[in-house]
């Protein structure tokens, strides 16, 4: 889209005569008609395909034409076009005599023509005026002309559309060649991408406006380069989000369980040896003569209940002595004189004889233990619940109470992240070990398919009037190849034919 501009400067008709040689009475009241058309090797009559324009009466016989662009735009004359400038043209300028005020072609006598010039050639788009002078036997016309682009059109042919903008679709101004020049703080093909705060982490940070650094889930800090540990992580750190890698001596999901209680608290008294035995637990091995969880109590040797199978302990100066009940013997009453005949197994245990009946062994039913099946099993001692689940004894069975986000008999299953349908616009959700992933349908993108994107440029049949659509798949753009008689980015505008003049 652009404008062909014609500046009339001077017309000389010293004798004041028409093309026929007849003089004008009282003088030649002169106006001009201009026809601009496609290049013709020999300029011939026919439609003015690029446009026409007429002037009012500008003077009598010989006169200079003043620049009247500020007062209504009559000089230079404007011939706008809404197609790609082809670089060549044909121009016809006619000078006519107006006997009266009606300048319409049908109102003038056929011999009112004063002079007619026709030129053709190449003309590039540019700001510089081309000066020309055409002389005939009786008249001389001096004029200049040029082609410039309309607002928002650029390039050698005024075919490149570029509209400066500062909104969601881009932040740019247009260079003289029509290329985009991004406003400060923006980048990308259409200057839609903000330039984040300098140093903002490439993967873990992003921004929606320049000089910003917004952190993706799991990251923190001014530059989004510090991971956020698991919520509740006490004595631990992370190298990726939601981790809780325990410091030395700490354990558990939140690193809040003391695995080195001995070093951190020194609980064992009276020279006892301390052994770490798990989460916040320890065992004190007491020196002789001491007892208690922390070996804090002095004891007689009988206090340690050395006599087994119901034997009673008697303190002596040099130690102790066990008095064994019937059926048992030995230093600690540890040997049995019972056999399977004495039915020694409790709680439904079955008895197996050993050493030709000299002693026996009990095979206990589930939930019972001990040499005579006399002890009930605590089913939670093996800590069967995964992912921090809490074990509860329920009669002969056990049950796991799971933490939020886990399920299953032993809390071994993650609750599906896809259960809440997080993918927008019909995206398909896939559960992953550390979260979820959305597969988006055509026309959508983003982590949750929330971003609308363009689809194959020609798929929407953007070209009108049976034009051919060509797509550039790498840039998702299209170009319409117009049939004869149509112009416009989508070939939607017919080439307008002006009113016919008697050229």
């Amino acid at each position: 889209s652009g404008v062909f501009q014609l500046q009339l400067q001077e017309f000389i008709n010293e004798r004041g005569v028409l093309a026929s040689g007849r003089p004008c009475e009282p003088g030649c009241r002169t106006f001009f008609r201009v026809c601009l058309k496609h290049f013709q090797a020999v300029v011939s009559p026919g439609p003015c395909t690029f446009g026409t324009v007429s002037t009012p009466v500008l003077g009598t016989n010989s006169f200079a034409v003043r620049d009247d662009s500020s007062g209504g735009g009559r000089n230079p004359l404007q011939l706008p076009f809404n197609f790609t400038w082809p670089g060549t043209f044909s121009l016809i300028i006619e000078a006519w005599h107006a006997p009266g005020d009606d300048l319409r072609p049908e109102a003038l006598p056929p011999d009112a023509l004063i002079s007619k010039i026709a030129i053709q050639g190449s003309l590039a788009v540019g700001q510089n005026w081309l000066l020309d002078e055409q002389t005939s036997t009786l008249t001389r016309l001096r004029y200049s002309y040029r082609v410039i682009c309309s607002d928002n059109y650029y390039g050698d042919n005024c075919s490149r559309l570029c509209k400066k903008r500062n909104d969601h679709f881009g932040h740019y101004v247009c260079q003289p060649d029509g290329n985009l020049s991004c406003l400060p703080g923006w980048t990308g093909e259409y200057c839609q991408q903000p330039i984040c705060l300098s140093g903002c982490h490439e993967q873990n940070g992003y921004c929606s406006k320049p000089a910003e650094c917004l952190c993706r889930p799991g990251w923190q800090g001014r530059l989004c380069n510090e991971c956020i540990p698991h919520n509740g992580c006490r004595h631990g750190t992370c190298s990726t989000p939601w981790q809780c890698t325990c410091d030395e001596g700490w354990g558990g999901l939140f690193c809040d369980q003391d695995l080195n209680y001995c070093t951190h608290h020194s609980p064992c008294k009276n020279g006892a040896t301390c052994s770490n035995s798990g989460q916040r637990s320890y065992t004190c091995t007491c020196r002789p003569g001491y007892t208690g969880v922390d070996c804090e109590l002095e004891l007689s040797e009988c206090d340690s209940n050395p006599c087994r199978n119901g034997g009673s302990c008697k303190d002596q100066e040099d130690g102790y002595h066990c008095l064994c009940p019937p059926g048992y013997y030995g230093l600690h009453c540890e040997h049995s004189t019972l056999s399977c005949a004495d039915s020694p197994c409790f709680n439904g245990g079955s008895c197996r004889e050993r050493n030709q009946g000299a002693n026996y062994a009990c095979e206990c039913p589930p939930n019972f233990t001990g040499s005579n099946c006399e002890k009930k099993v605590d089913r939670c001692t093996s800590n069967p619940c995964a992912n921090g689940g809490q074990c509860l004894n329920r009669g002969p069975s056990r049950m796991c109470r799971c933490r939020p986000g886990f399920t299953g008999t032993y809390c071994e299953l993650h609750v599906s992240d896809c259960a809440r349908n997080p993918c927008a616009h019909g995206g398909t959700c896939h559960d992953l070990e550390n979260g979820l992933m959305c597969t988006c349908p055509a026309g959508f993108s983003g982590r949750r398919c929330e971003v609308r994107t363009s689809i194959d440029a020609c798929a929407s049949s953007p070209c009108f009037n049976r034009a051919t659509c060509y797509t550039d798949l790498s840039t998702d753009t299209f170009v319409c190849n117009c049939p004869y008689g149509f112009v416009g980015s989508r070939c939607e505008f017919p080439v307008g034919l002006p009113p016919s003049f008697p050229w």
């Epitope: 570029c162 881009g170 363009s454 953007p462 753009t477 170009v479 989508r490």
Partner: nanobody
Framework: EVQLVESGGGLVQAGGSLRLSCVAS????????MGWFRQAPGKEREFVSS????????NYTDSVKGRFTISKDNAKNMVHLQMNSLKPEDTAVYYC??????????????????WGQGTQVTVSS
């Protein structure tokens, strides 16, 4: 951005007719043309028909030519799709779309779409 709301979908027997409507609100001055796409289960979204916002012409995909007619109600910023002689293969979710022509690039024109939420059309045999 342009907001689009479709209506008029439903269940119809083969050979019957339906009229879909789409009303546009928001920055309608940016619209270049409006039209309809459709997506059958398990298939890609495909173009059906479009109408130039300035009244310069209409386009149809080959399979609906002569059966579907697109029109525009300027006063209400609405586009209608009159669907006659419906076939079972026309069953799909029909989406209204507005095209915005943004900028001329070295390779051609880039277009952007705003979409409605879709309306179900079911044609039983």
């Amino acid at each position: 951005e342009v907001q689009l709301v479709e209506s008029g979908g439903g269940l119809v027997q083969a050979g019957g007719s339906l009229r879909l409507s789409c009303v546009a609100s928001g920055d309608t001055s940016e619209i270049y043309d409006m039209g309809w796409f459709r997506q059958a289960p398990g298939k890609e979204r495909e173009f059906v028909s479009s109408i130039h916002w300035g009244g310069r012409g209409t386009n149809y995909t080959d399979s609906v030519k002569g059966r579907f007619t697109i029109s525009k109600d300027n006063a209400k910023n609405m586009v209608h799709l009159q669907m006659n002689s419906l076939k079972p293969e026309d069953t799909a979710v029909y989406y209204c779309a507005a095209t915005r022509l943004i900028v001329y690039t070295p390779t051609g024109f880039r277009q952007y779409f705003d979409w409605g939420q879709g309306t179900q059309v079911t044609v039983s045999s």
